[in-house]
């Protein structure tokens, strides 16, 4: 539990301290205070670097001091023989004695009190971005007019975030443009267009002036565009260094402008507009696109018609065309549908004839029917050759889709009759 | 067959055997058998066999049995109360529609029908082949197929032969242009049990083929001249009957 003051005495004080002792005290005062620790008595066996017996003062990881020997006050009006001032609210005191003492040593007496610290001046790092105000037990930061204190209660910035742009066309500029932009600010602008439109950002080189990068090439102030998982920037310097037209391929864009404490410039101004999302002209073999265009964009509809001998295969058997729409994500609907060669299937068998197993049953394949010779012949002509036609039927040049008919050969005995002489 | 020789079914693959009455027929396509009207007038559900040279029981059990679906007797055939006393064999022709199609092969295949052109008009002396399991010189019924080659003869030659066992006055027997007279050479003739079989003549337009110019019908006396139904005169009736009684698949 933190206390405002306290006393620390070596073991048996004011009697001699015992050998082989190690004792520590953890001092803690309330947050916002420092500690003033002072010794009024010090009588500890002297050794080089206080290696035998010592009292150690540690603040965090830092050893503030290590004491041994006898001390007396330099000031006749003050009993203090040694003192320490730390700007932190915690301190550790450790007393150690070795296995022997050549004389009788009485140890030490020390006192601590909580002291106010000036956070605004006592530290190398300035706690406030703008104005620092000290008070007993703490401090607070404040801001110039038109600035506001951030949630960290230390940094001041301008109120430049939260704008959402939904119009298909618009203009966005840094705060105070073309006057210098505020330091130490993070401005976030959101562009949110209807799905199916991509944000296209246009900047003129002369409309951009942001504090230049440091010697390592890192932007001190920066403008960044984030579209989904794609990032454009960071950009900084005099004159826009990026592409003057940024096609984001997304309907959502976040613009982030980050500034540091120094070096304000006039800032930047950009225009944006929504372009219908383009869909690539995909290579769909064995088909024709109607209408044919150089570029297709969101909401465009095309009819994809299969060439003769090809059909759309997926559930809808035998369809020769399908519609595809350019979708909001830049992809075509029905993109899985393909024009595949028509499959005429296994040809039907015929009575008293046969058809050899075709190597393929796809469009253009050829099969041949034969009759069981010499007992049957093909009655309806056509030669027995059929090809797989575009309509999915096996077709003969003479008979069309009609199958050949094998009919018996008549009047032909397998062996001629020979009269036996009687 | 009188005066004939042993034949193999491969010589006459169109030959059909009827077991009741004992007779013959000619296969003309997968579904139809042509025979004489007098063969089927008394049995409208004949059992027929194809593909066997011998009609021994063991052979028929291995041959193809044909089951009739319907018998079509020519409308001009006069049905009698007492068929045994018949003297008029005009229009002695019938068709049997089969239940199932016949599978053709070396021992079973049809005979052609005559064309309608004058090429198929028979001249005296034209040779034809007859076959069957009917009476021979030795036995009432042949065990194995017999056949003979005999010439077409003028109708008067048949008229001149005295009927062996007349059931009526000799003048009562009817002779018409629907009949072919053939035989008279070396005693070769068809006989009882050969009825309905084909009188097969070489096709004038394709020498490799035979057509059914006639069907064994009747005769005055076995071993002389025989009378055969002139099939050419019935081609229209045959085609019409087959067309009107075919399944759509056959069309």
């Amino acid at each position: 539990e933190p206390t405002m003051y306290g006393e620390i005495l070596s073991p048996n004080y004011p009697q001699a301290y015992p050998s082989e002792v190690e004792k520590s005290w953890d001092i803690e005062v309330p947050e916002g205070y420092g500690i003033h620790l002072y010794f009024t008595h010090l009588d500890i066996e002297l050794s080089e670097n206080c290696a035998y017996d010592s009292v150690q003062i540690i603040s965090g990881d830092t050893e503030e001091g290590r004491l041994c020997g006898q001390r007396s006050s330099n000031n006749p009006h003050s009993p203090i023989v040694e003192e320490f001032q730390v700007p932190y609210n915690k301190l550790q005191v450790i007393f150690k004695s070795d296995f022997s003492n050549e004389e009788r040593f009485t140890g030490f007496a020390a006192y601590y009190v909580a002291t106010d610290i000036n956070e605004c001046t006592d530290f190398v790092d300035v706690p406030c971005s703008h104005f620092c105000n000290n008070f007993i037990g703490g401090y607070f930061c404040s801001c110039p007019p038109e600035y506001f204190l951030h949630d960290d209660m230390k940094n001041c910035g301008v109120n430049c975030s939260g704008d959402v742009f939904t119009a298909l066309i618009g203009e966005i500029a840094s705060p105070n443009y073309p006057k210098p932009y505020p330091e130490n600010s993070r401005c976030e602008y959101q562009i949110r267009l209807e799905k199916g439109f991509q944000v296209v950002v246009t900047l003129r080189r002369e409309d951009f002036d942001v504090e230049a990068a440091d010697s390592a090439g890192n932007c001190l102030d920066s403008l960044v565009f984030v579209a989904g998982d794609r990032q454009f920037g960071p950009y900084c310097g005099h004159g826009f260094p990026g592409p003057l037209n940024i096609e984001t391929k997304s309907n959502a864009l976040d613009i982030i402008f980050q500034t540091d404490l120094t070096g304000q410039k006039k800032g930047w101004k950009l225009r944006y507009h929504g372009d219908p999302m383009p869909c690539p002209k995909e290579d769909t073999p064995n088909s024709v696109w109607e209408p044919a265009k150089a570029k297709y964009v969101f909401r465009d509809v095309v009819q994809i018609t299969c060439l003769d001998g090809f059909e759309v295969v997926e559930g809808r058997v035998g369809a020769t065309s399908f519609y595809s729409t350019c979708q909001s994500n830049g992809k075509w609907s029905n993109s899985k549908l393909k024009c595949q060669p028509v499959d005429c299937g296994i040809p039907e068998s015929i009575e008293n004839g046969k058809v050899e197993d075709p190597e393929s049953t796809l469009f253009g394949s050829v099969i041949r029917y034969t009759c069981e010779e010499p007992y049957y012949y093909m009655e309806n002509g056509g030669g027995g050759e059929y090809h797989c036609a575009g309509n999915g039927s096996w077709v003969n040049e003479v008979l069309g889709p009609e199958l050949p008919k094998c009919v018996p050969v008549c009047g032909v005995p397998r062996e001629p009759f020979e009269e036996k002489q009687r | 067959i009188i005066g004939g020789s042993d034949a193999d079914i491969k010589n006459f693959p169109w030959q059909v055997f009827f077991d009741n009455p004992w007779a013959g027929g000619a296969l003309i396509n997968e579904y139809w058998v042509l025979t004489a009207a007098h063969v089927v007038e008394g049995n409208r559900e004949p059992t027929m066999y194809v593909g066997s040279t011998s009609v021994q029981t063991s052979r028929l059990a291995k041959s193809k049995m044909l089951t009739p679906e319907h018998v079509f007797i020519h409308p001009g055939w006069k049905l009698l109360e007492v068929p045994e006393g018949r003297t008029n064999f005009d229009n002695d022709i019938a068709l049997v529609r089969l239940k199932d199609p016949v599978k053709m092969g070396p021992t079973v295949s049809p005979i052609c029908l005559p064309g309608t052109s004058s090429d198929y008009n028979l001249m005296d002396g034209d040779l034809g082949l007859i076959s069957g399991w009917g009476r021979t010189e030795k036995r009432d019924r042949a065990v194995r197929l017999k056949a003979a080659r005999l010439p077409v003869a003028p109708l008067r030659k048949c008229k001149e032969v005295k009927v062996e066992k007349p059931t009526a006055d000799a003048e009562a027997y009817v002779f018409t242009p629907n009949m072919i007279c053939a035989g008279g050479e070396k005693g070769m003739d068809s006989c009882k049990g050969d009825s309905g079989g084909a009188f097969a003549v070489q096709d004038p337009n394709d020498k490799t083929k035979f057509y059914a110019a006639g069907l064994v019908s009747w005769g005055p006396q076995c071993g002389t001249y025989g009378l055969y139904t002139r099939v050419k005169n019935y081609v229209d009736w045959i085609m019409k009957t087959m067309q009107e009684n075919s399944t759509p698949r056959e069309d």
């Epitope: - | 077991d19 029981t57 052979r59 059990a61 291995k62 036995r139 194995r144």
Partner: antibody
Framework: EVQLVQSGAEVKKPGASVKVSCKVS????????MHWVRQAPGKGLEWMGT????????IYAQKFQGRVTMTEDTSTDTAYMELSSLRSEDTAVYYC????????????WGQGTLVTVSS | DIQMTQSPSTLSASVGDRVTITCRAS??????LAWYQQKPGKAPKLLIY???SLESGVPSRFSGSGSGTEFTLTISSLQPDDFATYYC?????????FGQGTKVEIK
Amino acid sequence: EVQLVQSGAEVKKPGASVKVSCKVSGDTLTELSMHWVRQAPGKGLEWMGTFDPEEGETIYAQKFQGRVTMTEDTSTDTAYMELSSLRSEDTAVYYCVTEGLAGVPFDLWGQGTLVTVSS
Amino acid sequence: DIQMTQSPSTLSASVGDRVTITCRASQSISSWLAWYQQKPGKAPKLLIYKASSLESGVPSRFSGSGSGTEFTLTISSLQPDDFATYYCQQHNSYRWTFGQGTKVEIK
């Protein structure tokens, strides 16, 4: 009129062979198919085998395979049936029978030959 | 070889009775079945062939039916001359076989 005349009765010792003849009169053997059937005393009919003229082969019932031989002498129109390795259970009347036509299995039966096998 | 099984083995009946004898084939024989009647010391006499065809000269009281594997011989009204042994015989395969016989005796 066709007739089948068989050889006379025979008495044989076990292990011996017997040859029964069957002469056709009134027809020729070549036109017929001859079968052989036997009947043991008080027992049923047993088909033994036949010569198939169409295939030119002799067909025997499995029971007699290896023990029976059927032959024909067409010059005398006589059929023969020889049964070897006789045993007492071969005692039977042996018939020659002609095959019928058009579904009739047996047409004509010989008068039968009694073969007695006894030691 | 195809097995033929006749039932019953013995049948006692009276004159005028309707008698049925059954024959079963071990495999299908279509209609290639015959029925014979045999009297002691005589050769068998053919009654029925092709399962149902009556041999000429056989009285019409005898009839046969069936096809495939099941066959019957029926005597519609038993006569004194009909007391004998009856055999079925298949002639579908060339290894012909007989049934074991059914003896019809006077009750």
